[in-house]
């Protein structure tokens, strides 16, 4: 396979269903903490979408840590049988659009938007900066694209396409893309490669948003950011399909992915935990 072929492969919904987290902490990286114990624990890996083993140091860390594989699965995975390919005339909203707005338990309040299923509109609320749920968007536009209905009863998706209510076909919306590229994937795909703080030299891939390709880099083994993938294919799956791209000799838009990419980004603003 050439690099170009690989980067233009369309990964279908059946191969990569939308990631819908049951709890925000399931998106946290495995964190062994600063202590030196060797304790077998489990965490949910958002890239492999599975619960995996890791070694916990015995103190601190985060909530993405479970005593058993079963507990991890119970908290962070959904039954694959629930992932039904949608063939109905009107695309359904993601489940999280129907969740109540959730400020979370922290107090670093920032403006976010949620879909109000009563008013059928995206509205502003104050998010505390941690936890909460996925009905939580950084912009009004993002919320509208994912959760609100379009004017003619179609669901506008997050990739500039709409489901045509007449013939059930996906119609590119050229008006949504003012520049050559517009990114609609996970926001971490736009971050630079980050080696992290340790001394290992692990082969990893990051998405280079400037050139629009996945590139190798050396990861130190700890720290860094979410733009960090164990394989090129995983990198492409997560980031490449987030681009809407104009075809060079025409006005149409080619959409790399014809479904919504669910947000799993966690806010890293300064936060203040409430006294429990």
């Amino acid at each position: 396979d050439s690099e170009e072929d690989e980067e233009h492969t369309i990964i279908t919904d059946t191969e990569l269903p939308p990631l819908k987290l049951m709890h925000s902490f399931c998106a946290f990286k495995a964190d062994d903490g600063p202590c030196k114990a060797i304790m077998k624990r489990f965490f949910f890996n958002i890239f492999t979408r599975q619960c995996e083993e890791f070694i916990y140091g015995g103190c601190e860390g985060n909530q993405n840590r479970f005593e058993s594989l079963e507990e991890c699965k119970k908290m962070c995975t959904r039954d694959n049988a629930n992932r039904i390919i949608k063939t109905t005339l009107q695309q359904e909203k993601p489940d999280f659009c129907f969740l109540e707005e959730d400020p979370g338990i922290c107090r670093g309040y920032i403006t976010r938007y949620f879909y109000n299923n009563q008013t059928k509109q995206c509205e502003r609320f104050k998010y505390g900066g941690c936890l909460g749920n996925m009905n939580n968007f950084e912009t009004l536009e993002e919320c509208k694209n994912i959760c609100e209905d379009g004017p003619n009863g179609f669901q506008v998706d997050n990739y500039g396409t709409q489901l045509n209510a007449v013939n059930n076909s996906l119609t590119p919306q050229s008006t949504k893309v003012p520049s050559l590229f517009e990114f609609h994937g996970p926001s971490w795909c736009l971050t630079p490669a980050d080696r992290g703080l340790c001394r290992a030299n692990e082969n990893r891939f990051y998405y280079n948003s400037v050139i629009g390709k996945c590139r190798p880099f050396k990861y130190s083994g700890c720290g860094g950011n979410e733009n960090n993938f164990t394989s090129k294919q995983e990198c492409l799956r997560a980031c490449k399909k987030g681009f809407i791209q104009r075809i060079s000799k025409g006005g149409l838009i080619k959409t790399k992915r014809k479904r919504k990419k669910q947000r799993v980004k966690i806010a890293y603003e300064e936060i203040f935990v409430k006294n429990m």
Partner: antibody, heavy 118, light 112 residues
């Protein structure tokens, strides 16, 4: 017409408790986050707290956090403020106010007076 | 918390004359979404507060157009082009950009 009517105010001793109610009408109550705001005699306005549309989550001012609890019953179109460990400085007219889609208070009730005194 | 400071605290005006109230915030009220959540309330004597203006300059329905709001960042102004008898009361600015919501001390408008 949007209407918010508070009740339950009265005289209470320091350390005592009181429960205020706000009856809403003229709009779909469950669609809106709701607030309590208070106004001490001859003073300005102070935000007390907010409850989300479904009632699962609340925000509180530091001055009342841990003592006051906001709840709602969407089936009854009612908002509540449970006030415990009351202090003299909690003496005020308490207003309920609706939150609009911009997370801003748009409609206010007529208020109910709470007096904390021995 | 964001401190809201109104001036003057008392404003005696002549009927038919203009009036202006200033409101300053201790930090910018421009939110990360590009909007400025500065609002004005009117509280007539013996009544509950009523929203006049939201998002700096948007008039609530039923509010006469003699009221105008302006400003940006930390400095805001409420103007009444021609004061009428029904405008008597206390006017509060308040901000909804930062949590918790905070209010100005109020400006009492009275007829000379």
């Amino acid at each position: 017409e949007v209407q918010l009517v508070e009740s339950g105010g009265g005289l209470v001793k320091p350390g005592g408790s009181l429960r205020l109610s706000c009856a809403a009408s003229g709009f779909t109550f469950s669609s809106y986050a709701m607030n309590w705001v208070r106004q001490a005699p001859g003073k300005g306005l102070e935000w007390v707290g907010t409850i989300t549309t479904g009632g699962s989550y609340t925000y509180y001012a530091d001055s009342v956090d841990g003592r006051f609890t906001i709840s709602r019953d969407n089936a009854k179109n009612s908002l509540y403020l449970q006030m415990n460990s009351l202090r003299a400085e909690d003496t005020a007219v308490y207003y309920c106010a609706r939150q609009d889609g911009n997370f801003l208070m748009d409609y206010w009730g007529q208020g109910t007076l709470v007096t904390v005194s021995s | 918390d964001v401190v809201m400071t109104q001036t003057p605290l008392s404003l005696p005006v002549t009927l038919g004359q203009p009036a202006s109230i200033s409101c300053k915030s201790s930090q910018s009220l421009l939110d990360i979404d590009g909007k400025t959540y500065l609002n004005w309330l009117q509280q007539r004597p013996g009544q509950s507060p009523k929203r006049l203006i939201y998002l700096v300059s948007k008039l609530d329905s039923g509010v006469p157009d003699r009221f105008t709001g302006s400003g940006s960042g930390t400095d805001f102004t409420l103007k009444i082009s021609r004061v009428e008898a029904e405008d008597v009361g206390v006017y509060y600015c308040w901000q909804g950009t930062h949590f918790p919501f905070t209010f100005g001390q109020g400006t009492k408008v009275e007829i000379k």
